[in-house]
Amino acid sequence: ECVTQLLKDTCFEGGDITTVFTPSAKYCQVVCTYHPRCLLFTFTAESPSEDPTRWFTCVLKDSVTETLPRVNRTAAISGYSFKQCSHQISACNKDIYVDLDMKGINYNSSVAKSAQECQERCTDDVHCHFFTYATRQFPSLEHRNICLLKHTQTGTPTRITKLDKVVSGFSLKSCALSNLACIRDIFPNTVFADSNIDSVMAPDAFVCGRICTHHPGCLFFTFFSQEWPKESQRNLCLLKTSESGLPSTRIKKSKALSGFSLQSCRHSIPVFCHSSFYHDTDFLGEELDIVAAKSHEACQKLCTNAVRCQFFTYTPAQASCNEGKGKCYLKLSSNGSPTKILHGRGGISGYTLRLCKMDNECTTKIKPRIVGGTASVRGEWPWQVTLHTTSPTQRHLCGGSIIGNQWILTAAHCFYGVESPKILRVYSGILNQSEIKEDTSFFGVQEIIIHDQYKMAESGYDIALLKLETTVNYTDSQRPICLPSKGDRNVIYTDCWVTGWGYRKLRDKIQNTLQKAKIPLVTNEECQKRYRGHKITHKMICAGYREGGKDACKGDSGGPLSCKHNEVWHLVGITSWGEGCAQRERPGVYTNVVEYVDWILEKTQAV
């Protein structure tokens, strides 16, 4: 069962896996959640009654029964991992810890104006896990305003001590705030010849890459496939690092694949969720249980529901044995990966889906797209919402996109003349406007947040957030779209679609069925040529056919320009403005969302 509250002055007895240092009990709980085996923890807070060497210790624990005996101890705070919970989990930690020095390998020292600047420097440095910043009140003159970037093998401090006039904090890479490049390519027949920090077994290069992504020290990897000549190294995933952050040597070797950590794009790509099945493959590990199951899908469900299960192997039933049920072997290991992978034995293996909740919901695969046609089908664009105004009468006002369970991203120009959020209604999961009746459920709007630099659509900053009064329960017909990664600024999107209920021509009416159009992106230079009277800034993005014919139009405003990249849909643009609709050599102009990621995160993650 899911227990989120912390138990004060309580210590769990036994079950120790390892001890790490964390600045708070809250962060200890996060570390426990992300550890492959931890189910419970005990944290020691600073206290005069405690030995200072034990302050800030976070003892990660495991138990077959999923609980441990409780003992009263002053300054101890205990709790359970969020593995047992169904809610979305994030490792993002924006807290700043005053008068704490988080110890690690100090590899870079520079002057910074503020702790925030120091944190940004850490976030944009490939090696940095956390930082300590000496404030201008720090006693040592030469250390005042010094920003120390730090890393450790585990990603957590090796020790935490009290130190007056300093502040410490963590890198915000896991908050999607890094400007580091996001390199998704996997390079076939390539070995990166740099130092290995760890090695695990993996069924394919994609799983290897995901493991690298959530390993604190891994910057890139090499994977030896099952056809690799050296048998003892088959399915071996080597996690690697280098001082420069890039591979120093690439060696051409057949049957090996290499790639990079997806740390800078992990909010828009699944990194914990290994959802594939591996046929004719057996995963070896510590056996947790053997149960009968009808299929490998059923076996995966059993593994997902057993909190300690990390991976499984399913052996299909022999002919009519056991009512057609096969054997489902639920397994675990110290690091969450199989200890060995065997092929040719007829098993079907896979991983628990319990960790999928650690990935952003927006990365979930949606229904295959319907090719051709202009009318959408239900569930094709599950992030698309219709924003209605009820004054003077109810009507469709603008489009918008679900980007979080309480957040809609849309255009600022939609709110011209809108005096209060009370007159707004957000409808999600809608295909036809005619579905909206008096009793159709909707989301009320609690707050309209318009970019404070917005004046008019043509001059940019045409972006707004709607905070909903209640949260959206994600289903197949209503779920979020991923924001583009800041590290993806150089990606060339080739599969982009504009959607909305807007006019189909300049003098028209709102459409009943959600319309879709595939539209190519246009470079800003090209776009500027088409709009000589306007300034096309880097905060805008243009799309359209040279000959016209397909475009967004009145009523589509605020809706998404959605682009598919590496199987994940990204909200690349917000429909903003254009000269007429679908006119020749007049592309549509959209708000370039990647340039506003910081603004969006600042507003949506504000306490």
């Epitope: 100090n106 520079s110 720090f138 040592s140 003159l141 030469e142 250390h143 010094i146 120390l148």
Partner: antibody, heavy 124, light 107 residues
Framework: QVQLVQSGAEVKKPGASVKVSCKAS????????MHWVRQAPGQGLEWMGI????????SYAQKFQGRVTMTRDTSTSTVYMELSSLRSEDTAVYYC?????????????????WGQGTTVTVSS | EIVMTQSPATLSVSPGERATLSCRAS??????LAWYQQKPGQAPRLLIY???TRATGIPARFSGSGSGTEFTLTISSLQSEDFAVYYC?????????FGGGTKVEIK
């Protein structure tokens, strides 16, 4: 062992510039700050400025602002101090001295390693 | 800037005797003070930092005390190699400033 070796003595005319070098060895050059201190004949010590060899940031005493430039070359672990528009009162022994270890935060320190000094004579 | 004043300017002491040197700051420098020894024709040598911590390799006869604006360097039993000029220096604010020095000479 840890040492700072400075360039040789210089004789300059008023209005000219002088560039003194200080080569560090025996420690990680970029991890410590470097100060420049001078001493006129028969006088006390006078602090001129500081450089952080890691990023190259500098801070100068007001008295020398606009006349002094401190630079570093990390490839040779050398810091340089250039003083321009020389006048006779700039005749002194110029020292480089290692300052705080910048990769650790601690409260107190001093200039623990000094160069042998470079005599600069300004005379017409 | 912070002005550091040392007294006396010259101190005449016999070998084996105790020497007490004073340093006053024009405003508080907390414990951000260092003491140096300089012999003729040589570079200064760090003796004390943080007002009272002996630098590596400095004999125990050298000790520092004080905080705020008043500081003292004490040499408990003067040896022949201790006759030199002693400077105090504040590390509390830019620009760093030195005292004028105290010359310890043989009586």
């Amino acid at each position: 062992q840890v040492q700072l070796v400075q360039s040789g003595a210089e004789v300059k005319k008023p209005g000219a510039s002088v560039k003194v070098s200080c080569k560090a060895s025996g420690y990680t050059f970029t991890s410590y700050s470097m100060h420049w201190v001078r001493q006129a004949p028969g006088q006390g010590l006078e602090w001129m400025g500081i450089i952080n060899p890691s990023g190259g940031s500098t801070s100068y005493a007001q008295k020398f602002q606009g006349r002094v430039t401190m630079t570093r070359d990390t490839s040779t672990s050398t810091v340089y101090m250039e003083l321009s528009s020389l006048r006779s009162e700039d005749t002194a022994v110029y020292y480089c001295a290692r300052g705080a270890y910048l990769l650790e935060l601690y409260y107190y320190y001093g200039m623990d390693v000094w160069g042998q000094g470079t005599t600069v004579t300004v005379s017409s | 800037e912070i002005v550091m004043t040392q007294s006396p300017a010259t101190l005449s002491v016999s070998p084996g005797e105790r020497a007490t040197l004073s340093c006053r700051a024009s405003q508080s420098v907390s414990s951000n003070l260092a003491w140096y020894q300089q012999k003729p024709g040589q570079a200064p040598r760090l003796l004390i930092y943080g007002a009272s911590t002996r630098a590596t390799g400095i004999p125990a006869r050298f000790s520092g005390s004080g905080s705020g604006t008043e500081f003292t360097l004490t040499i408990s039993s003067l040896q022949s190699e201790d006759f030199a000029v002693y400077y105090c220096q504040q590390f509390n604010d830019w620009p760093l400033t030195f005292g004028g020095g105290t010359k310890v000479e043989i009586k």
